[in-house]
């Protein structure tokens, strides 16, 4: 048993069918010896008297808000969270797995620049007594503080029969350094409880594994005189790191037909403006990158050749 | 050339062989189906490798203040990955293929060094770690967390040499 | 919103066998702990079993230990009991409850409920 926060336990049990569980003392905060009942939530129905209360904890039935109490007036609280491994697996029944980029990741993280400022969010078909806590650092063993915000729900959407929560979190590294080569990943620690159920997740990554830049600004198209050809310019985002001669981006422009059918034309460069031919009902689209570490491309920004 | 006495380097050669080397260190290790290689344990084995840290002077204002902190910093590294890619980590079992851009990675590293350090001027270089996997197995998993090291290192130093290019050429 | 329709009531001889099923509908049943709760005539509502949501993990009240079986049918949207070794005091309404929290035999720690199926046990 560890405590979470001030009069909040997480009991953690190892079921199994006709498993013992885990015995409880709970102890009641008061100067008082004498005369001291206990009882679970709502129930009046007194569990045990006296300062300690032993009780077994098997079940979720087990758990919830024990009360300790003389002659009718409440002297103290403590909440039992459990934290269930069944089959030798701590359970992740709260979060959904995203699938992405592998089977069991429950949370995803994104950078726009190498501030030291990410974002990460997860989903849940959860809708009522649901609470999240997120902590971070950079390294474990002496971490570097990252100071997280609340998490809060950023969208809904509906999958078939259920409901989807995404839920979000923004950080900040509180010393970050965007020129230097990270030797420590950044680690998120997220603690979920749902009713009587508590599980945390975690994610350990370096800002440059998880850069995802905003898509180019500005997309503009110049007709070449005389010629099918146009020139297609963009500005770096507002959001991406500067010096932009030392953070570089690398883009990709693309033509693409109204139909998904067709041949799309593309084109690399590092520059800010690229020629190409513009075909009739397409459209013109350019997405950004690191230029010198591959992280994930930009979303595009698009103009219709038009 | 980065002489005795700090003069600058050939920041545009520098420039276009370092955005070489990146091209190569994603080319030798491309993201193999997102293995996360940080899970598989003996964080020893890649601890010991050089990194471009925070008081290196590889920042935008640190270049302009004083470039050699950083050149020599860089240099170690490369000077470090050129022996790691030359050890039996590399050359070793299992074999690899003929037209791996591991070798032409090798040789980029060692031109690059030779660019920022002249023969006959010598910055210390850091001792490179008795890494000998046994298995092959293991040789496998340590060249790919050495080229995601050294993709991380490169992305820095081409950076470095970009900017100087852009702001620092005479 | 989730409807639990139970079925297979009845009334069956004392050591015979019968076996009840909970259709679920309306949301994704794979993500929910199933289980069955009984009423007894001028009693309180008693925790039956349940089966976990992943991996089909039972678990019985001790008065059903051994005779009571439940399962589960993801692709059907479906879970049985099947009870044997019947004895009157099985007697009682059924009912079929869906939560997130397994193991529990706590009733306020269910979501959903089905009407209940009739069960009667004669001696």
């Known amino acids: 048993i560890w405590e979470l926060k001030k009069d909040v336990y997480v009991v953690e049990l190892d079921w199994y069918p006709d498993a013992p569980g885990e015995m409880v003392v709970l102890t009641c905060d008061t100067p008082e010896e004498d005369g001291i009942t206990w009882t679970l939530d709502q129930s009046s129905e007194v569990l045990g008297s006296g300062k300690t209360l032993t009780i077994q904890v098997k079940e979720f039935g087990d758990a919830g808000q024990y009360t300790c109490h003389k002659g009718g007036e409440v002297l103290s609280h403590s909440l039992l969270l459990l934290h269930k491994k069944e089959d030798g697996i701590w359970s992740t029944d709260i979060l959904k797995d995203q699938k992405e980029p592998k089977n069991k990741t429950f949370l995803r993280c994104e950078a726009k620049n190498y501030s030291g400022r990410f974002t990460c969010w997860w989903l849940t078909t959860i809708s009522t007594d649901l609470t999240f806590s997120v902590k971070s650092s950079r390294g474990s063993s002496d971490p570097q503080g990252v100071t997280c915000g609340a998490a809060t729900l950023s969208a809904e959407r509906v999958r078939g029969d259920n409901k989807e929560y995404e839920y979000s979190v923004e950080c900040q590294e509180d010393s970050a350094c965007p020129a230097a080569e990270e030797s420590l990943p950044i680690e998120v620690m997220v603690d979920a409880v749902h009713k009587l159920k508590y599980e945390n997740y975690t994610s350990s990554f370096f800002i440059r594994d998880i850069i995802k830049p905003d898509p180019p600004k500005n997309l503009q198209l110049k007709p070449l005189k005389n010629s099918r050809q146009v020139e297609v310019s963009w500005e770096y985002p507002d959001t991406w790191s500067t010096p932009h001669s030392y953070f570089s981006l690398t883009f990709c422009v693309q033509v693409q037909g109204k139909s998904k059918r067709e041949k799309k034309d593309r084109v690399f460069t590092d520059k800010t403006s690229a020629t190409v031919i513009c075909r009739k009902n397409a459209s013109i689209s350019v997405r950004a990158q690191d230029r010198y570490y591959s992280s994930s491309w930009s979303e595009w920004a698009s103009v219709p050749c038009s | 050339r980065a002489v005795p006495g700090g003069s600058s380097p050939a920041w545009t050669q520098c420039q276009q062989l370092s955005q070489k080397l990146c091209t190569l260190a994603w080319s030798a290790h491309p993201l193999v189906g997102h293995m996360d290689l940080r899970e598989e344990g003996d964080e020893e084995t890649t601890n010991d490798v050089p990194h471009i840290q925070c008081g290196d002077g590889c920042d935008p204002q640190g270049l302009r203040d004083n470039s050699q902190f950083c050149l020599q910093r860089i240099h170690q590294g490369l000077i470090f990955y050129e022996k790691l890619l030359g050890s039996d980590i590399f050359t070793g079992e299992p074999s690899l293929l003929p037209d791996s851009p591991v070798g032409q990675l090798h040789a980029s590293l060692l031109g690059l060094s030779q660019l920022l350090q002249p023969e006959g001027h010598h910055w210390e270089t850091q001792q490179i770690p008795s890494l000998s996997p046994s298995q092959p197995w293991q040789r496998l998993l340590l060249r790919f967390k050495i080229l995601r090291s050294l993709q991380a290192f490169v992305a820095v130093a081409a950076r470095v040499f970009a900017h100087g290019a852009a702001t620092l050429s005479p | 919103e989730v409807q639990l329709v139970e079925s297979g009531g009845g009334l069956v001889q004392a050591g015979g066998s019968l076996r009840l099923s909970c259709a679920a509908s309306?949301?994704?049943?794979?993500?929910?702990?199933m289980g069955w709760f009984r009423q007894a005539p001028g009693k309180e509502r008693e925790f039956v079993a349940q089966?976990?949501?992943?991996?089909?993990?039972?678990y019985y009240a001790d008065a059903v230990k051994g005779r009571f079986t439940i399962s589960r049918d993801n692709a059907k949207n479906t879970v049985s009991l099947q009870m044997n070794s019947l004895k009157p005091e099985d007697t009682a309404v059924y009912y079929c409850?869906?939560?997130?929290?397994?193991?529990?035999?706590?009733?306020?720690?269910?979501?959903?409920w089905g009407q209940g199926t009739q069960v009667t046990v004669s001696s």
């Open positions: 409850a869906i939560g997130s929290l397994f193991p529990s035999s706590r009733e306020r720690d269910y979501d959903y």
């Open positions: 309306g949301r994704t049943f794979s993500g929910y702990d």
């Open positions: 089966i976990s949501r992943h991996n089909s993990n039972t």
